[in-house]
């Protein structure tokens, strides 16, 4: 069989394409990539709203804060930031709004100091399970990431191909247990219908979790027990109907927690009694006096804190013989 023509003679089979990414000429100390603005004093490079189609190859080695927002990157290949010498100081990377729809395995490898990563407002239809871990090993080297911002990364409906977007994101968060040190995770505005039950247990260092503006209906199978460091939990603007006893007890048991529950369609029936009792006693819910009923109709806009057990009834279920058609 004929072999393809190639731009290199022979590479290792595991990463045959990294050579071109890494072998770019080392940038001059004060060089700034075309279409970017650089400040060596601030250790900052901004390549913003320039329709870049790839990550510049000649980023200065001093860069600590890199803004690549508002571009047309589309794809982040393996080793997208691999350089010789490596970008050893890069700590904050913002790629928001750059029309990324494919982030591949190992995209953020060779960034030993990367603590903050923002991929928000990109239609991530193809997020590799190994995007953050860089390897398909069952246990990867720990990622230095402390803050991961993934707000509004849900692709258009026609690009989701009948698969679980939640599952794809969670697979990337959990792969190789690389993100054990993650302290802030933002997943707002992603149309999440559910939270896979194992995700929080494997992110034990979380301080801040933002799940606002999703479509979460229930937290019944989600455990917060391990998140002993959690300080803020944003659940505003979801589809939550009620929080059950198990969830209430777990939240109450977290020593530093503040919970945000505004703008959920609370169903004020007999199942709400425990939550109302809890709300009246707890200090963990911020703005609890703003929480109001959405259903049933007769309870709409009633303030949860003002309800008593007599208000919270369930219509009796009639036996079949008494039901009318």
């Amino acid at each position: 069989s004929s072999s393809p023509t190639s731009s290199a003679s022979s590479f290792s089979s595991s990463a045959p394409f990294l050579a071109s990414a890494v072998s770019a000429q080392p940038p001059l100390p004060d060089q700034c990539p075309a279409l970017c603005e650089c400040s060596e004093a601030a250790r900052t490079v901004k390549c913003v709203n320039r329709n870049l189609t790839e990550v510049p190859t000649d980023l200065p080695a001093y860069v600590r804060n890199l803004f690549l927002t508002g571009n047309q990157l589309a794809v982040l290949p393996a080793g997208a930031f691999a350089r010789r010498p490596p970008l050893a100081e890069l700590a904050a990377l913002n790629l928001s709004g750059s029309r990324l729809d494919e982030v591949r395995a190992g995209a953020f490898e060779h960034l030993p100091s990367l603590r903050q990563l923002d991929l928000s407002h990109n239609p991530l239809a193809d997020l590799s399970p190994f995007a953050f871990s860089g390897s398909n090993a069952s246990v990867s080297a720990p990622s230095p990431l402390v803050e991961l911002i993934l707000n509004h990364i849900v692709p258009p409906e026609d690009e989701r191909q009948n698969r679980s977007f939640e599952g794809m994101v969670v697979a990337a968060l959990l792969a190789g247990r690389a993100l054990q040190g993650l302290r802030r995770l933002e997943l707002a505005s992603n149309h999440f219908l559910y939270l896979p039950r194992d995700v929080l247990a494997q992110l034990p260092s979380l301080r801040h979790l933002d799940l606002s503006n999703n479509s979460l209906v229930s937290l019944t199978y989600v455990s917060f027990r391990n998140l002993t460091h959690l300080e803020s939990l944003h659940l505003e603007d979801n589809a939550l109907k009620v929080l059950h006893n198990g969830t209430l007890a777990e939240l109450q048991g977290l020593p530093h927690i503040r919970v945000f529950l505004d703008n959920n369609p609370w169903v004020c029936d007999c199942h709400m009694a425990d939550m109302v009792t809890w709300l009246k006693e707890t200090e963990v819910v911020q703005g609890k006096d703003r929480l109001t009923c959405a259903y049933p109709e007769k309870m709409r806009n009633r303030v949860l804190l003002e309800l008593n057990s007599a208000d919270l009834d369930c219509d009796p279920i009639l036996p079949p013989s008494l039901q009318t058609s």
């Epitope: 731009s7 394409f17 047309q72 494919e102």
Partner: antibody, heavy 117, light 108 residues
Framework: EVQLVESGGGLVKPGGSLKLSCAAS????????MHWVRQAPEKGLEWVGY????????YYADTVKGRFTISRDNAKNTLFLQMTSLRSEDTAIYYC??????????WGQGTTLTVSS | QLVLTQSPAIMSASPGEKVTITCSAT?????MHWFQQKPVTSPKLWIY???NLASGVPTRFSGSGSGTSYSLTISRMEAEDAATYYC???????????FGSGTKLEIK
């Protein structure tokens, strides 16, 4: 060593269909995006379409949209191009190409499609 | 839609001569890739991201440019450089990958 081998070309009548394959080896196929590119006789290179590493993103050139479908089987290290409603202007050598660190890093040797009555 | 126009379409150069091929884009692009294709063979990635030589490419080749104007230069033409060269870039979203019209370089 990276190898890409296309197959499935041949002579097809206008309006007919054909499926091309590209067998990949020498690299972790499932980690990289793949393109199809074609070259009509004595003409330049024309991009046909792209499929992402995990198969969930596919782009097509306007000239083939709705007629061609790109797919891949990561378990078998194989890329496919299903072509329907073929026209004489689809006559070309069809190449598969990797999108590794850069678009079109490696190319196969090509397979020839002739559309003629 | 982005159109990449190469000039000249055909040119010939003597051994040792300096050669420059240009690629003009209808709208500003952030970088350019170049490919070399010899008769009856597949194209090869030759220069990526405007100025980076692909592995194995002789150092007599260089690339430069910005905005709408890019070029590939051979400092001293050699017989093995005779080939057709294509520029390439991507535009829009969803992306469209566009190749230039090609420049056929012959040896005198």
């Amino acid at each position: 060593e990276v190898q890409l081998v296309e197959s499935g070309g041949g002579l097809v009548k206008p309006g007919g269909s054909l499926k091309l394959s590209c067998a990949a080896s020498g690299f972790t196929f499932s980690d990289y995006g793949m393109h199809w590119v074609r070259q009509a006789p004595e003409k330049g290179l024309e991009w046909v379409g792209y499929i992402s590493s995990g198969t969930y993103v596919v782009y097509y050139a306007d000239t083939v949209k709705g007629r061609f479908t790109i797919s891949r089987d990561n378990a078998k290290n194989t890329l496919f191009l299903q072509m329907t409603s073929l026209r004489s202007e689809d006559t070309a050598i069809y190449y598969c190409s990797t999108y590794g660190s850069n678009p079109f890093d490696y190319w196969g040797q090509g397979t020839t499609l002739t559309v003629s009555s | 839609q982005l159109v990449l126009t190469q000039s000249p379409a055909i040119m010939s150069a003597s051994p040792g001569e300096k050669v420059t091929i240009t690629c003009s884009a209808t709208s500003s692009v952030s970088s350019m890739h170049w490919f070399q294709q010899k008769p009856v063979t597949s194209p090869k990635l030759w220069i990526y991201s405007t100025s980076n030589l692909a592995s194995g490419v002789p150092t007599r080749f260089s690339g430069s440019g910005s905005g709408t104007s890019y070029s590939l230069t051979i400092s001293r033409m050699e017989a093995e450089d005779a080939a057709t060269y294509y520029c390439q870039q991507r535009s829009g979203y969803p992306p469209i990958f566009t190749f230039g019209s090609g420049t056929k370089l012959e040896i005198k």
